[in-house]
Each structure stands twice: as structure tokens, then as C-alpha cells.
């Protein structure tokens, strides 16, 4: 899963430029947009991926909010500022000096302000709810089988430790995948739930970020699981701060 030596590519991120200019002539890959070196043995951070994506932007998404503290990515694509580790900077600003605070998955969690806006810390998104609706099938999937295959998917494709897949709920045709990862639970080397969710979202949309891999082909006991819509909800360790004006 490291940068492939033979043809010098990044298996986990096709939005990279790779060349054999690393130590000892090893293949080294840099993210488009930021030029930051990426570790091709694991997922690239969402911040670097969004930054790379801005070279070929697509339409923004709008999701529905299920509860008062859940955030959705209403603002769609933007060109984010990433820190040296590739994480989102707590404060993001656009070219017209409009600024806002974001959480660890880059979703806005405050009203927009000006350059005087302060974002004291990057607030961690510790709970992600992925809400899927699958296309009609001959019968409902077996819940246990579905749980096993979705856990396998997150473990195998996104390298997310199973302990972070808190639950898989199923009421045909709705599947809900709960990812939970507190700051204290995330060890060095663990894939971030926000990054796994973003790769999954792009896979579901047919926009895989993996180099040269086919799109997502998920089957449960040989029966294709085809998703017709996805909503992703984000819950932060500290609730967001929006004015009442936004809520009306």
C-alpha cells in the first residue's frame, strides 16, 4: 500500500503527482493543490483531498439535518487551508475575507464572519452517521450479513479499525452506519473516521479516490448492494455555535 515502486503511483490517492525523487530513489507522491507529501499506505486527509479537488470542482451537496446538533455539508466545496499534518485549520476564509470555523471534517460550525473571527481550537467530529438508501432487491438483506460486509468494507478498503464502526442499523431500504472515534480513542496510525467517511462517500458517488481500482462493488452473499442516495451527518465533541437567525 505504499507508493508503488514499479510505476510510481499512489494506490490510496489518485489526486497526486508521484516521482522517484524520495530517499534512495524511492517513489514519493505529493497531493495536487497543496504539494504536500502523502503517505500512500493509508488514506489521505480530507483537507488535502478537498484542496486537490478544487483543481476540478464539482457541484456542491446539500444534506438534511436530523437533529439540533448534527451538521451537514451545506456549503459544499471550498478551497480549504490545511495545517502541516494535512488537517483542516480551525478557521477557514475565502478570497473576500469572509471567515468561519470548521470541525475536523471541514464542515462549517459557526456563522460566517470577517477576519476578526476567532476559532480557538479545531473541534473534533467524534460521531458520523452515514444514512444510505439501497435500491429495491428481491428481498431484504439479512441484517447480520449486511453488518459483516459493511464492517469488512471499512476494515479492508478504508483500513478503519472495526472498533470505530459503532453500529450498522437496517430497516429496509435504509442502512445507517455509525462511526465513532473520540480524541482519546484515536491512536497514532489509526485512520480518521472523517477521512474514511469521505472516501466512502466518493466511492458511493462513483468518484473513487483510489488509484486504478474499480469502483465500489459491494455484494452481500452475492447480491449487489446498490445505493441510490446517501446523507452524512456529523456530530462534534462540542456542539456548534450558530445564531438563532440561522435556525429560523
Amino acid at each position: 500500500h505504499t507508493a508503488a515502486q514499479d510505476n510510481c503511483t499512489c494506490p490510496t490517492n489518485k489526486m497526486t503527482v508521484c516521482s522517484p525523487d524520495g530517499p534512495g530513489g524511492r517513489c514519493q507522491c505529493r497531493a495536487l493543490g497543496s504539494g504536500m507529501a502523502v503517505d500512500c499506505s493509508t488514506l489521505t486527509s480530507k483537507c488535502l483531498l478537498l484542496k486537490a479537488r478544487m483543481s476540478a470542482p464539482k457541484n456542491a451537496r446539500t444534506l438534511v439535518r436530523p437533529s439540533e446538533h448534527a451538521l451537514v455539508d451545506n456549503d459544499g466545496l471550498y478551497d480549504p487551508d490545511c495545517d502541516p499534518e494535512g488537517r483542516f485549520k480551525a478557521r477557514q476564509c475565502n478570497q473576500t475575507s469572509v471567515c468561519w470555523c470548521v470541525n475536523s471534517v471541514g464542515v462549517r460550525r459557526t456563522d460566517k464572519g470577517d477576519l476578526s473571527l476567532r476559532c480557538d481550537e479545531l473541534v473534533r467530529t467524534h460521531h458520523i452517521l452515514i444514512d444510505l438508501r439501497h435500491r429495491p432487491t428481491a428481498g431484504a438483506f439479512n441484517h447480520s450479513d449486511l453488518d459483516a460486509e459493511l464492517r469488512r468494507l471499512f476494515r479492508e478498503r478504508y483500513r478503519l479499525h472495526p472498533k470505530f464502526v459503532a453500529a450498522v442499523h437496517y430497516e429496509q431500504p435504509t442502512i445507517q452506519i455509525e462511526l465513532r472515534q473520540n480524541t482519546s480513542q484515536k491512536a497514532a496510525g489509526d485512520v480518521d473516521i472523517g477521512d474514511a467517511a469521505y472516501y466512502f462517500e466518493r466511492d458511493i458517488k462513483g468518484e473513487s479516490l483510489f488509484q486504478g481500482r474499480g469502483g465500489l462493488d459491494l455484494r452481500v452473499r452475492g447480491e449487489p448492494l446498490q445505493v441510490e442516495r446517501t446523507l452524512i451527518y456529523y456530530l462534534d465533541e462540542i456542539p456548534p455555535k450558530f445564531s438563532m437567525k440561522r435556525l429560523t
Partner: antibody, heavy 117, light 111 residues
Framework: QVQLQESGPGLVKPSQTLSLTCTVS?????????WNWIRQPPGKGLEWIGY???????LYNPSLKSRVTISRDTSKNQFSLKLSSVTAADTAVYYC??????????WGQGTLVTVSS | DIQMTQSPSSLSASVGDRVTITCRAS??????????LHWYQQKPGKAPKLLIY???NLESGVPSRFSGSGSGTDFTLTISSLQPEDFATYYC?????????FGQGTKLEIK
């Protein structure tokens, strides 16, 4: 009825590559499930080597990953194991098996591979 | 890797006995709806045969005298009344994490 059958040389020289093939009947390997290799040294327990999925994705045991390749030939409904740089410690009965939803419901009868000069 | 420890390593019993084999995982192998622990029987010179999947589900064609229970890290395989054909080696296997791992086996012998 799903059936799996291993085939390949029973004797491999040290430092060479062990190559085995599993022929599947009764189910198309590209239609679903995960197609595994598992081994068992004489008188010892079972060790999972890795799998190739219905879509061609691989997953390998990290302890063997640098030496293992599992591939498939969907036209023949076969999947294969290659284990490079073998030593006497790789002497084992090698089984192919189908992983349904993370358990092995169908197994081949196994084939003994001895590594010896 | 998740370590699977079976006990006892070997066991002598008589036809008609009730036998219990335990399997302990080094960390939980359960999810909210699944227990990723499976049991196999192996006879000399033969491939393992699936008995119980996901801790308590009896594989089709397996006699009802076999049963499984447990969750989290501790699991049990029970044979309610031993039959002559049950003398074999039994393995547990976890599939919650890769690499998949097996217990070291429990050899069930005739007393």
C-alpha cells in the same frame, strides 16, 4: 453444490516460489464471496494466508504479505496462490476455502506442499 | 493481531458425555449485531468443517447436539451428548479483524 479442489506441485525447493491453484465448481468466483487460502503445518494449527474477492480485491495476512500473491482466472473459475522465497517453515497442507460473510463454509480437501532440497 | 486461546488443549471424554470447549479472544470480536466467532471440526487427514458460525448459528446439516454461545471475548462450544464420530480436533476462528486468526485447537479423545 459448491466444490473446491487444490492442485499444484507437492515438492518445492527452498528459495523458490510455491504455486497452487484452486478450481471452483458450482459457483462463479466473480459472482460473490471471498476466496481464501489457509494453511496448516503438519501437526499444528490453522493459519489464514489471504483472499481474493469476487471483484478481484486482495487482502493478505501481514505476516506473509511481502511474499504472497493471490490472483484469479475467472474464465476458468480458478484462483491461485503464489508464495515466494519459501523455506522449510512453509511446509504445510494448503487449503482453499470460501468465505461467505467472514466464515469459511466450503473447503477444498487440502494439498500437502513440502519444502525441501 | 487478535490472539485466540482455546481451553483445554486436549480433552478425554466418553460417548454420551456433555463436553464444553472454551475460546477466549484477546479483544472483543463482537459488534452491535454480530459475534464474529466461528467453530470448526477437523478429523485427521481431512479439511476443517464449519459447525457454528457467528457464535451460535448451527451450520446446515450439523447435528443439533452442537451448540455455541458467548459474546465479546468469551465463547463456548458445547456438545450435549458425545457420539463416536465427534472425536476430532475443534478450532475457533475470529473474523472481526484481519488477519483472521484461529485458536490453537482442542483435541477431543476417547477416554
Amino acid at each position: 453444490q459448491v466444490q473446491l479442489q487444490e492442485s499444484g506441485p507437492g515438492l518445492v525447493k527452498p528459495s523458490q516460489t510455491l504455486s497452487l491453484t484452486c478450481t471452483v465448481s458450482g459457483y462463479s468466483i466473480s459472482s460473490g464471496y471471498y476466496w481464501n487460502w489457509i494453511r496448516q503445518p503438519p501437526g499444528k494449527g490453522l493459519e489464514w494466508i489471504g483472499y481474493i474477492s469476487y471483484s478481484g480485491r486482495n487482502l493478505y495476512n501481514p505476516s506473509l504479505k511481502s511474499r504472497v500473491t493471490i490472483s484469479r482466472d475467472t474464465s476458468k473459475n480458478q484462483f491461485s496462490l503464489k508464495l515466494s522465497s519459501v523455506t522449510a517453515a512453509d511446509t504445510a497442507v494448503y487449503y482453499c476455502a470460501r468465505d461467505t460473510t467472514a466464515y469459511f463454509d466450503y473447503w477444498g480437501q487440502g494439498t500437502l506442499v513440502t519444502v525441501s532440497s | 493481531d487478535i490472539q485466540m486461546t482455546q481451553s483445554p488443549s486436549s480433552l478425554s471424554a466418553s460417548v454420551g458425555d456433555r463436553v464444553t470447549i472454551t475460546c477466549r479472544a484477546s479483544e472483543s470480536v463482537s459488534s452491535s449485531v454480530n459475534r464474529f466467532l466461528h467453530w470448526y471440526q477437523q478429523k485427521p487427514g481431512k479439511a476443517p468443517k464449519l459447525l457454528i458460525y457467528r457464535a451460535s448459528n448451527l451450520e446446515s446439516g450439523v447435528p443439533s447436539r452442537f451448540s455455541g454461545s458467548g459474546s465479546g471475548t468469551d465463547f463456548t462450544l458445547t456438545i450435549s451428548s458425545l457420539q463416536p464420530e465427534d472425536f476430532a480436533t475443534y478450532y475457533c476462528q475470529q473474523s472481526n479483524e484481519d488477519p483472521y486468526t484461529f485458536g490453537q485447537g482442542t483435541k477431543l479423545e476417547i477416554k
